[in-house]
C-alpha cells in the first residue's frame, strides 16, 4: 500500500485539523523545552509543505519519509545545542538512527514548571479570545509533560476540554461547571498517560512478543465470544498502532487506530455484543469507547481447558508445530474463562505453562511430566488474591491518606535510595488502588488492582531508569515485566542502606503550608514522612505514627496562630527536637 507521498497520504486521511494537532503533539513530545510559539511555527511550515504535496505528490521532497521530514524540521531549531545538550548530536545521524536517538532523549520527568490553573474568568477569556490557540496550547502543555501520551487519545481529551469550556463559559456559575470537569480531565489524563507509558515500556524494553501476549490476554477477557483468529487479528492490528505511537509515528498511529475502530465496528457481531453504543459515536469518542468497553458475557458451556492443554496426547506435537500460536491459544482460552484474573496473572500462568512444556516435551514421558501443570497455578493465583484481601482490609481500616502513608513507609524501607519526590508520587498512586479497586466485588478486584499496580510500578521504573540509584529497583524492573509487582512485594527492608544524615532544614516548615490545598498539604507531610524513614529506617510504625501525629497537630496549631511564621519557627524547633528524641536520632 505504497504512496508516492506519505505526508500527502496522511494529510488526506486525517484532515488538516487532526494533522496539525498530531504534528504539534509529536514535536512537543520530542522537543519538550521549546516554547509554544516555536512549535506552532514549525507545525505551520510542515502543514504548508504537506498541502503542496497534496496538490502535487511529485513535488520536491514529497517522497521523503515522515521521519526524514519531521527530523529535518526539528533539526532547524536554532537553540538545539544550548537547550538540549547532547540531543543535538541526534541531528548528525541519518534515519532511522536519528529518530531512535530522539526517542531515547524523551524525558519522563522534564524540568518544567507546574501547570497553575488561572481564574475561571481568565481561562474563559483566553478561550473566547482565540479558541484555536487555547486548544493548541493544551495539546502542547500535555504532550511536552507526557512524552508518551497516546496521541489519538490526546485528541479526544482536547475535544472534551473544548466542550467543557464551550459549555461552562456560558454557564451561570462558571466555576462550579468548569472546575470539576477540569479536575476529571486532569485525573483521567494522568491515568491515561501512565497506562500508555506501560504499553510503550512493554514494547521497548520487552519486545513485541511481550506486548502481544498482554493484548491476547486482555482482548480475550474483553471479547470472550470472539474466535481465536479474530482476537489474533485484533492483536496484530493493535500492536501495530501502539508500536507506531510509541515510536513517534503519530500520524500513522492515529490513521491505523481509526481503521481498527472501523474494522471492529463493521465486525462487531463476531467480536462483542457490547460494542453497539460505542460504534454509534463519532471517531474519537468511538475509539475511546472501544478501548474502555466492558467485558462481554462469557459463552455458555465452555469446555474444560484440561482436555486440550493437559489431557490431550497431542500437546507436545501441537506445541512443537507452532509454539507461539499454541501458547497464544492457551492464553486466549484461559483469559476468556477468567475475567476475574489480572492480565499479569494470566501471563504468569502462560509462562508457567510454557516453562513446563519446554521441560516436559523433552522428557521420557511428556504426558506424565505435565499432567499436574494446572496444580502449579494454584499458588500463583492465591498470592495476588491474598495480597489484595490484606491490603483492602488495611485500606478500609485506615482510609486513603493513612493507607498511602503505610505504603510510603513500606516502600521507603524497601528502596530508600530512590528520590523522595518519586517515592511520594509512586506511593500516593499505589495507595489510590484502595479507593479505585477495593469497592469492587471479588470478581473484579484482582484485574482492577493488580493491573493498576503494574501501571504505577512502571512509573517507578521509568523514573528510576533516568537516574538509577537502586540495584533492587533495577532488578525488579528489568527481570520480568509480569513479575514486577511480586518482585517489589517480596522486597524486605534494605539492610545495606546507610541512614541519611539528619538535616533540620528538611523538617523546617513555614506559614505558606497553611494556604496550600489539602492535597498539597498531604504531600508536604508525606515528604516529611519519607525523610523520617530515610533517617531512621528501623523506626517502628508506632514511633512514626507518634511523630506524624505531632507534626499534624503542629501544622494545625500554627495555621491558627496570629503570628504564623513565628509559631512555625519556634514550635518547629521544639517538634524537631521531640521527634529526634522519640526516634532516638
Amino acid at each position: 500500500d505504497a504512496h508516492k507521498s506519505e505526508v500527502a497520504h496522511r494529510f488526506k486521511d486525517l484532515g488538516e485539523e487532526n494533522f496539525k494537532a498530531l504534528v504539534l503533539i509529536a514535536f512537543a513530545q520530542y522537543l519538550q523545552q521549546c516554547p509554544f510559539e516555536d512549535h506552532v511555527k514549525l507545525v505551520n511550515e510542515v502543514t504548508e509543505f504537506a498541502k503542496t504535496c497534496v496538490a502535487d505528490e511529485s513535488a520536491e521532497n514529497c517522497d521523503k519519509s515522515l521521519h526524514t521530514l519531521f527530523g529535518d524540521k526539528l533539526c532547524t531549531v536554532a537553540t538545539l545545542r544550548e537547550t538540549y545538550g547532547e540531543m543535538a548530536d541526534c541531528c548528525a545521524k541519518q534515519e532511522p538512527e536519528r529518530n531512535e536517538c530522539f526517542l531515547q532523549h524523551k524525558d519522563d520527568n522534564p524540568n518544567l514548571p507546574r501547570l497553575v490553573r488561572p481564574e475561571v474568568d481568565v481561562m474563559c477569556t483566553a478561550f473566547h479570545d482565540n479558541e484555536e490557540t487555547f486548544l493548541k496550547k493544551y495539546l502542547y502543555e500535555i504532550a511536552r509533560r507526557h512524552p508518551y501520551f497516546y496521541a489519538p487519545e490526546l485528541l479526544f481529551f482536547a475535544k472534551r476540554y473544548k466542550a467543557a469550556f464551550t459549555e461552562c463559559c456560558q454557564a451561570a456559575d462558571k466555576a462550579a461547571c468548569l472546575l470539576p470537569k477540569l479536575d476529571e480531565l486532569r485525573d483521567e489524563g494522568k491515568a491515561s498517560s501512565a497506562k500508555q507509558r506501560l504499553k510503550c515500556a512493554s514494547l521497548q524494553k520487552f519486545g513485541e512478543r511481550a506486548f502481544k501476549a498482554w493484548a491476547v490476554a486482555r482482548l480475550s477477557q474483553r471479547f470472550p465470544k470472539a474466535e481465536f483468529a479474530e482476537v489474533s487479528k485484533l492483536v496484530t492490528d493493535l500492536t501495530k498502532v501502539h508500536t507506531e505511537c510509541c515510536h513517534g509515528d503519530l500520524l500513522e498511529c492515529a490513521d491505523d487506530r481509526a481503521d481498527l475502530a472501523k474494522y471492529i465496528c463493521e465486525n462487531q457481531d463476531s467480536i462483542s455484543s457490547k460494542l453497539k453504543e460505542c460504534c454509534e459515536k463519532p471517531l474519537l469518542e468511538k475509539s475511546h469507547c472501544i478501548a474502555e468497553v466492558e467485558n462481554d458475557e462469557m459463552p455458555a458451556d465452555l469446555p474444560s481447558l484440561a482436555a486440550d492443554f493437559v489431557e490431550s496426547k497431542d500437546v507436545c506435537k501441537n506445541y512443537a508445530e507452532a509454539k507461539d500460536v499454541f501458547l497464544g491459544m492457551f492464553l486466549y482460552e484461559y483469559a476468556r474463562r477468567h475475567p476475574d484474573y489480572s492480565v499479569v496473572l494470566l501471563l504468569r500462568l502462560a509462562k508457567t505453562y510454557e516453562t513446563t512444556l519446554e521441560k516436559c516435551c523433552a522428557a521420557a514421558d511428556p504426558h506424565e511430566c505435565y499432567a499436574k501443570v494446572f496444580d502449579e497455578f494454584k499458588p500463583l493465583v492465591e498470592e495476588p488474591q491474598n495480597l489484595i484481601k490484606q491490603n483492602c482490609e488495611l485500606f478500609e481500616q485506615l482510609g486513603e491518606y493513612k493507607f498511602q502513608n503505610a505504603l510510603l513507609v513500606r516502600y521507603t524501607k524497601k528502596v530508600p535510595q530512590v528520590s523522595t519526590p518519586t517515592l511520594v508520587e509512586v506511593s500516593r498512586n499505589l495507595g489510590k488502588v484502595g479507593s479505585k479497586c477495593c469497592k469492587h466485588p471479588e470478581a473484579k478486584r484482582m484485574p482492577c488492582a493488580e493491573d493498576y499496580l503494574s501501571v504505577v510500578l512502571n512509573q517507578l521504573c521509568v523514573l528510576h531508569e533516568k537516574t538509577p540509584v537502586s540495584d533492587r529497583v533495577t532488578k525488579c524492573c528489568t527481570e520480568s515485566l509480569v513479575n514486577r509487582r511480586p518482585c517489589f512485594s517480596a522486597l524486605e527492608v534494605d539492610e545495606t542502606y546507610v541512614p541519611k544524615e539528619f538535616n533540620a532544614e528538611t523538617f523546617t516548615f513555614h506559614a505558606d503550608i497553611c494556604t496550600l490545598s489539602e492535597k498539597e498539604r498531604q504531600i508536604k507531610k508525606q515528604t516529611a514522612l519519607v525523610e523520617l524513614v530515610k533517617h531512621k529506617p528501623k523506626a517502628t510504625k508506632e514511633q512514626l505514627k507518634a511523630v506524624m501525629d505531632d507534626f499534624a497537630a503542629f501544622v494545625e496549631k500554627c495555621c491558627k496562630a496570629d503570628d504564623k511564621e513565628t509559631c512555625f519557627a519556634e514550635e518547629g524547633k521544639k517538634l524537631v527536637a521531640a521527634s529526634q528524641a522519640a526516634l532516638g536520632l
Epitope: D121, T125, H128, T166, E167, C169
Partner: antibody, heavy 124, light 108 residues
Framework: EVQLLQSGAEVKEPGASVKVSCKAS????????ISWVRQAPGQGLEWVGR????????GYAQRLQGRVTMTTDTSTSIAYMEVRSLRSDDTAVYYC?????????????????WGQGTMVTVSS | DIVLTQSPSSLSASVGDRVTITCRAS??????LNWYQQKPGKAPKLLIY???SLQSGVPSRFSGSGSGTDFTLTISSLQPEDFATYYC??????????FGQGTKLEIK
C-alpha cells in the same frame, strides 16, 4: 452579521400559554448563552431567565418559576421561551439577547446582541 | 437578590454637556456590571461591560468606572442621539441578573 430575529406579536387570553421564538444567525449558536428580558409598557427591564445553549441548563427569575420554560433547537439555531398560565401583568415586550463572551479576564455576562422584541398582550 | 439603584431617575441636559449616571449595588459585585442604552420602541444596546470596558462600535465619549458597590456611566460630551434611557445590570450573583430601574436622559 450577528442577528437575533424574534417571532411576531401575540395576543392571548388570561390562563393561556405563549411561545416566543428567537432565531440566531451570524455566529455559532451553541457557543453563546441566551437570556430573556421583558419590559412592561412604560416600565424598566426585568430579567426573565437564561439558557445554556450547549447543554440546555436553565435559570429563571423567582417570580416566573414554574410558569416559564426555555428551550433551544441547536439544529435550527432557535431559542424558545414559553410562558404558561398567562396573567394581565405578563403583558410586555419580551426580548431575547445573546450572552456575550468573556473579555479582558472577566465574564460579565453582558447582553451584547438583542432581538427586536415580541409584544405579548394578555387581555380578556 | 442584589438590588441596583440608579440615580438620578431622570435628568435634563444639553448637547455638549458632561453627564454622569450612578448605579449603586446593595452588596459588592466586583466589576460585574454592564450599562445599556434604550431608545423608545427599540431594543436595549450594550454600551459598557465589566464596569469599564467599552463595547466595540460604541463611541468613546461613553465611559464607565467603579467596582464593588458604586459605579458610574459618564458621557463626556452629549450628542443629540444620546437622549435615551440608560440601565445598569449586574451579573455577579448567579441568576437573577437584576437591572437598575433606569435613568431617563432628556433634552433640556
Amino acid at each position: 452579521e450577528v442577528q437575533l430575529l424574534q417571532s411576531g406579536a401575540e395576543v392571548k387570553e388570561p390562563g393561556a400559554s405563549v411561545k416566543v421564538s428567537c432565531k440566531a444567525s451570524g455566529y455559532t449558536f451553541s457557543s453563546y448563552g441566551i437570556s430573556w428580558v421583558r419590559q412592561a409598557p412604560g416600565q424598566g427591564l426585568e430579567w426573565v431567565g437564561r439558557i445554556n445553549t450547549y447543554n440546555g441548563n436553565t435559570g429563571y427569575a423567582q417570580r416566573l418559576q414554574g410558569r416559564v420554560t426555555m428551550t433551544t433547537d441547536t439544529s435550527t439555531s432557535i431559542a424558545y421561551m414559553e410562558v404558561r398560565s398567562l396573567r394581565s401583568d405578563d403583558t410586555a415586550v419580551y426580548y431575547c439577547a445573546r450572552l456575550g463572551h468573556c473579555q479582558r479576564g472577566i465574564c460579565s455576562d453582558a447582553l451584547d446582541t438583542w432581538g427586536q422584541g415580541t409584544m405579548v398582550t394578555v387581555s380578556s | 437578590d442584589i438590588v441596583l439603584t440608579q440615580s438620578p431617575s431622570s435628568l435634563s441636559a444639553s448637547v455638549g454637556d458632561r453627564v454622569t449616571i450612578t448605579c449603586r449595588a446593595s452588596q459588592s459585585i466586583s466589576s460585574y456590571l454592564n450599562w445599556y442604552q434604550q431608545k423608545p420602541g427599540k431594543a436595549p444596546k450594550l454600551l459598557i461591560y465589566a464596569a469599564s470596558s467599552l463595547q466595540s462600535g460604541v463611541p468613546s465619549r461613553f465611559s464607565g468606572s467603579g467596582s464593588g458597590t458604586d459605579f458610574t456611566l459618564t458621557i463626556s460630551s452629549l450628542q443629540p442621539e444620546d437622549f435615551a434611557t440608560y440601565y445598569c445590570q449586574q451579573s455577579y450573583s448567579t441568576p437573577p441578573y437584576t437591572f437598575g430601574q433606569g435613568t431617563k436622559l432628556e433634552i433640556k
